[in-house]
């Protein structure tokens, strides 16, 4: 069962399975629900009637009751992960912690202006996971104003101690905040030849990768493949660091694979959530449990409603014993991963699937895409709403996407005129417009954020946040588009579709079935050909046929542009403009999101 | 058919900078890792840089290391090497090719020749 | 790094001939071996990879062989358009290193 407030003045006895040090019983929290076997913890605050050494502490710990006995002790805080939760969990952490010293590998030291210069400079370092920043008030006079970058091998500081007159933060990167690089290439029969920080058994290349970016000290990595002809080290994942934070070398090898940790562009990739089944494979590991299971399917969602259950190994039934069930191996391990990998068994492995709200609910894959034809069907763009006004009367007024359980994402343009967010209502999960009757749930509108920019459409800027009055429960028909990340700047999308209830040509009417079509992006060089008298920027981007045919038209604005790249489908561009709809040498213009990542986080992440 | 074609190069005095470029057709560029490969008038081939995919990642050799920087533009198809603090021993024949998964130069570029002389 | 030294610098032979060039790694390289050929003024051209895979579109009078440091290049009843020059790189780790190339020439 969930709980999630915490337990003050109280301390959980035994169970004990590692200590850490955080800044507060929340960040405490946070970092139990992400250990793999964490299920309750016990943090002690600072207080006087506490040994200094023990503020601070966290205390990992794990019960296969999933409970412990409580202990009434002062200071003590404690509390259960949120593995047991079903809402979305995220590591990102913006709190900054006032005369604190939070502590580590002291490896760059600097001056910066402010604390939050020295929350960015860490956020964009490769290696940092936390500072310290010395403020102007700090006794010290050559120190003050210095931020401190620090690392940990747990991501964790070694110890926290006061010290008046500094404050200390973690890195943003968990909270998609971080420029840096992410280098989505797999290298094939390669070995990354740098110091190993930890290794770890996967079934493949793609969930070594996902254990490298979230580990913390993890920013490449080595994979050996079930063909790598030592037999001992088949499916293992070599988790490496280096000083420059890449590789010094490449060496070919046969049958090895090796990438890097994009934990910089994490949230718009499923890390934690291995979702894929592992035919004629074993997983080997700590058993839970032996349950009896009609398909792997079955033995996968039994694994992922026992909290302990990391992994499973399933053994479909001999001809027709155990009424045609097979027998579902539940299993954990000290690290979340097989302990051992075997093949030509005749298993049927795979993950737990508890772990994948710890993923932004955008990375979960959708329908396949219906080929073919113009009109949608129900479900093939979960992200797409439909914004109506009431005044003077109920019409659509403009597209828009779900980028968050709060937050719609469309166009600043939809809003001239529009003199309240109360004449505003969000339809989700709509695939005909004359679905929506008198009755008809929709949300309403508690925001209306546009950019400070804004003008007008052709000069850029055309952004809008639309902050909803309650939140939206996801549903196949109703779910997030990732925002592209900061870090996929280089990425060419190739797949591209534009959505919207639009006009099909310039002079028409709003269409009843949500409209798709596919438009290739164009570069913003042919683009400013195109646009003469317009200032294409790189804050745009724009998308069409060089013989037109097809386009955004009225009524598509704010709608998405939506991209899929590696599986997952990436809001690109935002309908703004055009010179007619779907002419010749004339693209769509759309506002080029990533360009906007920072804005939408700034407002959507607002405490 | 792949095409790589190679321009910028010229004279330049010692000291100085050039910017080569290498536009590719004929293939998906934002798939392959590219290189510069050079060759010094009568000599061997000598291999320059390398940029992965998606451009995070690039390799020198000690040679140019701290002078030259590779990078490349996916949604233009094309290829960049930045040289600077140019000397005398720089001046080649300088190739644009694909690195492939063989870890072999797949396809080459008709190179452009940087001299570098006063 | 790794040293590669082709040997030898130079060859000459006839139409219809068999030629042997060798190439010798200053390490152990496996059969991370890449063979070219360059006519000249023009850019190089790859023959073989992974010490004996033939490149698409390769003859088949080409051949290479050998593992561990030692490696040769064969080309059996050599054409005219054969003679130019040759070099080994080598494929096993970053910095690539090539060879000083070995010309062939017409006897």
């Known amino acids: 069962e969930c709980v999630t407030q915490l337990l003050k003045d109280t301390c959980f006895e035994g169970g004990d399975i590692t200590t850490v040090f955080t800044p507060s019983a929340k960040y405490c929290q946070v970092v139990c629900t992400y250990h793999p076997r964490c299920l309750l913890f016990t943090f002690t605050a600072e207080s006087p009637s506490e040994d200094p050494t023990r503020w601070f502490t966290c205390v990992l710990k794990d019960s296969v009751t999933e409970t412990l006995p409580r202990v009434n002790r002062t200071a003590a805080i404690s509390g259960y992960s949120f593995k047991q939760c079903s809402h979305q969990i995220s590591a990102c952490n913006k709190d900054i912690y006032v005369d604190l010293d939070m502590k580590g590998i002291n490896y760059n030291s600097s001056v910066a202006k402010s604390a939050q210069e020295c929350q960015e400079r860490c956020t964009d370092d490769v290696h940092c996971h936390f500072f310290t920043y010395a403020t102007r008030q700090f006794p010290s006079l050559e120190h003050r104003n210095i931020c401190l970058l620090k690392h940990t091998q747990t991501g964790t500081p070694t110890r926290i101690t006061k010290l008046d007159k500094v404050v200390s933060g973690f890195s943003l990167k968990s909270c998609a905040l971080s420029n840096l690089a992410c280098i989505r290439d797999i290298f094939p029969n390669t070995v990354f030849a740098d110091s190993n920080i930890d290794s770890v058994m996967a079934p493949d290349a793609f969930v070594c990768g996902r254990i490298c970016t979230h580990h913390p000290g993890c920013l490449f990595f080595t994979f050996f493949s079930q063909e790598w002809p030592k037999e001992s080290q088949r499916n293992l994942c070599l988790l490496k660091t280096s000083e420059s934070g890449l590789p010094s070398t490449r060496i070919k090898k046969s049958k090895a694979l090796s990438g890097f940790s994009l934990q910089s562009c994490r949230h718009s990739i499923p890390v934690f959530c291995h979702s894929s089944f592992y035919h004629d494979t074993d997983f080997l590991g700590e058993e839970l449990d032996i349950v009896a299971a009609k398909s792997h399917e079955a033995c996968q969602k039994l694994c992922t409603n026992a909290v302990r259950c990391q992994f499973f190994t399933y053994t479909p039934a001999q001809a027709s014993c155990n009424e045609g069930k097979g027998k579902c191996y539940l299993k954990l391990s000290s690290n979340g991963s097989p302990t051992k990998i075997l093949h030509g068994r005749g298993g049927i492995s795979g993950y737990t699937l508890r772990l994948c709200k710890m993923d932004n609910e955008c990375t979960t894959k959708i329908k396949p895409r219906i080929v073919g034809g113009t009109a949608s069907v129900r479900g093939e763009w979960p992200w797409q709403v439909t914004l109506h006004t009431t005044s003077p009367t109920q019409r659509h007024l403009c597209g828009g996407s779900i980028i968050g359980n709060q937050w719609i994402l469309t166009a600043a343009h939809c809003f001239y005129g529009v003199e309240s967010p109360k004449i505003l209502r969000v339809y989700s999960g709509i695939l005909n417009q004359s679905e929506i009757k008198e009755d008809t749930s929709f949300f309403g509108v508690q925001e209306i954020i546009i950019h400070d920019q804004y003008k007008m459409a052709e000069s850029g800027y055309d952004i809008a946040l639309l902050k909803l009055e309650t939140t939206v429960n996801y549903t196949d028909s109703q779910r997030p588009i990732c925002l592209p990340s900061k870090g996929d700047r280089n990425v060419i999308y190739t797949d591209c579709w534009v959505t919207g209830w639009g006009y099909r040509k310039l002079r028409d009417k709003i269409q009843n079935t949500l409209q798709k079509a596919k438009i290739p992006l164009v570069t913003n060089e042919e683009c400013q050909k195109r646009y003469r008298g317009h200032k294409i920027t790189h804050k745009m981007i724009c998308a069409g046929y060089r013989e037109g045919g097809k386009d955004a038209c009225k009524g598509d604005s704010g709608g998405p542009l939506s991209c899929k790249h590696n599986e997952v489908w990436h809001l690109v561009g935002i309908t703004s403009w055009g010179e007619g709809c779907a002419q010749r040498e004339r693209p769509g213009v759309y506002t080029n999101v990533v360009e906007y990542v920072d804005w939408i986080l700034e407002k959507t992440q607002a405490v | 058919e792949v095409q790589l074609l190679e321009s910028g190069g010229g004279l330049v005095q010692p000291g100085g900078s050039l910017r080569l470029s290498c536009a590719a057709s004929?293939?998906?560029?934002?798939?392959?890792?590219m290189a510069w490969v050079r060759q010094a008038p009568g000599k061997g081939l000598e291999w320059v840089s390398s940029?992965?995919?998606?451009?995070?990642?690039?390799l020198y050799a000690d040679s140019v290391k701290g002078r030259f920087t590779i990078s490349r533009d996916n949604s233009k198809n094309t290829l960049y090497l930045q040289m600077n603090s140019l000397r005398a021993e720089d001046t080649a024949v300088y190739y644009c090719a694909t690195w492939g998964d063989s870890w072999g130069f797949d396809f080459w570029g008709q190179g452009t020749l940087v001299t570098v002389s006063s | 790094d790794i040293q590669m030294t082709q040997s030898p610098s130079s060859v000459s032979a006839s139409v219809g001939d068999r030629v042997t060039i060798t190439c010798r790694a200053s390490?152990?390289?496996?059969?991370?071996l890449a063979w070219y050929q360059q006519r000249p003024g023009k850019a190089p051209k790859l023959l073989i990879y992974d010490a004996s895979t033939l490149q698409s579109g390769v003859p088949s009078r080409f051949s290479g062989s050998g593992s561990g440091t030692d490696f040769t290049l064969t080309i059996n009843s050599l054409q005219p358009e054969n003679f130019a020059t040759y070099y080994c790189q080598q494929a096993d780790s970053f910095p690539i290193t090539f060879g000083q190339g070995t010309r062939l020439e017409i006897k």
């Open positions: 940029i992965v995919p998606s451009g995070g990642w690039t």
């Open positions: 390490q152990g390289i496996s059969s991370w």
């Open positions: 004929g293939f998906t560029f934002s798939d392959y890792e």
